[in-house]
Amino acid sequence: SIPWNLERIIPAWHQTEEDRSPDGSSQVEVYLLDTSIQGAHREIEGRVTITDFNSVPEEDGTRFHRQASKCDSHGTHLAGVVSGRDAGVAKGTSLHSLRVLNCQGKGTVSGTLIGLEFIRKSQLIQPSGPLVVLLPLAGGYSRILNAACRHLARTGVVLVAAAGNFRDDACLYSPASAPEVITVGATNAQDQPVTLGTLGTNFGRCVDLFAPGKDIIGASSDCSTCFMSQSGTSQAAAHVAGIVARMLSREPTLTLAELRQRLIHFSTKDVINMAWFPEDQQVLTPNLVATLPPSTHETGGQLLCRTVWSAHSGPTRTATATARCAPEEELLSCSSFSRSGRRRGDWIEAIGGQQVCKALNAFGGEGVYAVARCCLVPRANCSIHNTPAARAGLETHVHCHQKDHVLTGCSFHWEVEDLSVRRQPALRSRRQPGQCVGHQAASVYASCCHAPGLECKIKEHGISGPSEQVTVACEAGWTLTGCNVLPGASLTLGAYSVDNLCVARVHDTARADRTSGEATVAAAICCRSRPSAKASWVQ
Amino acid sequence: QDEDGDYEELMLALPSQEDGLADEAAHVATATFRRCSKEAWRLPGTYIVVLMEETQRLQIEQTAHRLQTRAARRGYVIKVLHIFYDLFPGFLVKMSSDLLGLALKLPHVEYIEEDSFVFAQ
């Protein structure tokens, strides 16, 4: 009789875990910024501290009647989803509630900021174990709310936020759009995006993953033993906050970057029907449903990577897009994508001591995306080698010339606007191991890394006939670090990574006029980390 | 995720001199004013004044006080509702939108954001 949502996110081998661990043994603390809550509810009694924090706007309307059970409804349900005795994800976790939403579920950016500051002060006054902050709220894009989240995240706090229920791009809302926050969209029992009336879950590149958020049974504030179903991205975020709490209670030293990477890596993949999302958002939205990952002891030193999309560059001629990894992550490769195919490629550059992935729009293009592959590579030392464009008719080759450095990604950037020069040479010279082979008139950038036991290899797949996309996957045990379209057909839209799959996209019109000799090639660089081995390039 | 989304950023037209008052030497305002793109969610009259990252504790208080003093000279009463020290330097202020130009010219100010609603999801 386990509720569907818990069954979905907690694999069978974890389901008896609670009963083996002493109650309340976890030192993890979850802070919930929401409505007031009913602390005496059976689900959460004894695990919840209702702080004296209260920063809410007045309720609207002169005839508004404050009814305690209604005022507490949203927060009580979420507290139950996180740590409820019976329907909670992290049953032993202690929770602190801060009231930032009024009885109508409305709050302010300023009230939320003061709440976040309250948490920071508590942290300074009495340092404790790992902290998770659940933000089951959303407002319009706010630079300061995002900045506050960034500052708090940099103190080691893990923030989890609702993507929003506006059936819209999550990047238009805060705190959902803050990169340092784990942003969660909502799915139903069929693993499909949640519809809420005429609206539904938000989507897009600012969503990290999805979690159950429809008809979630949890504590009802109507009475101390009442239960009810609620739906929304708040419920989804509460599931992920619970998962994070469980991960941290097992391994308190996990960092935000490790937590996010593990959540992504161990999530259920490709079950969401992407057709629900607007067409232009489908490629940007992660097809991931959260599940509780195994501990790092059980999974060894896997190489973990995720794909980070930039904002759209906009259509101006010199528009650039920038994708960034989290501070702890290594940028192992950079690619670009444009729906019109008019792009001048991508490159990696250092900005303020951090490597960033850049993409450049071309004249007449509708804009580009930069696509960064961000990885956790312990003790990595990475650098970029680039070669200016070669003379017409020649290819450019770049390889990793430092000892024990392996190639993890290639980028190509054209100095010229004329797309027609990017023709594949009649004969492509045989690729040397660990080399980036450039298109004509392209500057080539090689991402080279040294890390204990890091080994990489290239995998190519070419299609000569008509095809909208070419894909190549890294096999089990290997992780995709780089993905490119190799000097190929007349017009490619670009390349990007979806989990362990490298996708090279071709323009529809380019398919018809392609000659059989012009194969579109998707090139994947696949790496793995074997701590005992030396860094090497595998042929 | 860090680019500004559908977000209003306004550079207010500012006079180079503040009513010619001697102690208020011209300060070129590089600070911007930001507000929610959804009009119904805006809370005009309440503003979060965000100061430069390295602003010291005392400077935060001085900036808030300076704003109060300069507003008073113009016949406006403003209320500092909260001072942010621990997460970022800044303060929350209740004031007329007429004073935004003045506030943006204060030293240490990086940007000012109009308060707005957030909602349970």
């Epitope: 009789s1 002493p22 059976r42 004894g46 409820g84 005795r85 504590a219 009442c226 239960f227 009810m228 | -």
Partner: antibody, heavy 118, light 107 residues
């Protein structure tokens, strides 16, 4: 598996006290409330009170408030119900029952028969 | 205290019959109602929780419905092993109160 094992039958004189125990196993003892419910011969079920084993907090039915005491010993995962000033109408089967918040009283002890007779 | 009025107090039905028992609360109890089965000399067994949710391992012929003040318990096709006394119970507030029970017999 979850088990609640109660102490054996008791025969008491009017005015005396009885202390019934209920030993829990197969789950985290402090995570779930324990209730006491009694049933007089040929009658229905009557709720006496509850204890939260985590902190020891109790909540009694007004009817029994002056005579009942519920305690717990977390080291042995045992709860106790003591009823004082016994009278003949207290003759009943006394059950302990675990409450899972979502699932109500999902596990019950086998019952302890208390007979009050002079 | 919240009163739970159960009806009928006893009923006789044939194997295969559809049996319905009702329970009326003296005030709104949301969906915080459970149904139990008790066989002679045994402890009660949980069948339905939160008004309509079947507990683990309970056969699908048992169902519950209702919210607020009116609740119904149904056995869709009576089996010989279903002979017992059935109780409703409100979990909305303390003191917890039970209905007086419905004794079910086979015709």
């Amino acid at each position: 598996q979850v088990q609640l094992v109660q102490s054996g039958a008791e025969v008491k004189k009017p005015g005396a006290s009885v202390k019934v125990s209920c030993k829990a196993s197969g789950y985290t003892f402090t995570s779930y409330y324990m209730h006491w419910v009694r049933q007089a011969p040929g009658q229905g079920l009557e709720w006496m009170g509850e204890i939260n084993p985590s902190g020891g907090r109790t909540n009694y039915n007004e009817k029994f408030k002056s005579r009942v005491t519920m305690t717990r010993d977390t080291s042995t995962s045992t709860v106790y119900m003591e009823l004082s000033s016994l009278r003949s109408e207290d003759t009943a089967v006394y059950y302990c029952a675990r409450e899972r918040p979502l699932h109500a009283m999902d596990y019950w002890g086998q019952g302890t028969t208390v007979t009050v007779s002079s | 205290d919240i009163q739970m009025t159960q009806s009928p107090s006893s009923l006789s039905a044939s194997v295969g019959d559809r049996v319905t028992i009702t329970c009326k609360a003296s005030q709104d109890v949301h969906t915080a109602v459970a149904w139990y089965q008790q066989k002679p000399g045994k402890a009660p067994k949980l069948l339905i929780y939160s008004a309509s949710h079947r507990y683990t391992g309970v056969p699908s012929r048992f169902s519950g419905s209702g919210s607020g003040t009116d609740f119904t318990f149904t056995i869709s096709s009576l089996q010989p092993e279903d002979i017992a006394t059935y109780y409703c119970q409100q979990r909305y507030s303390t003191p917890r109160t039970f209905g007086q029970g419905t004794k079910l017999e086979i015709k």
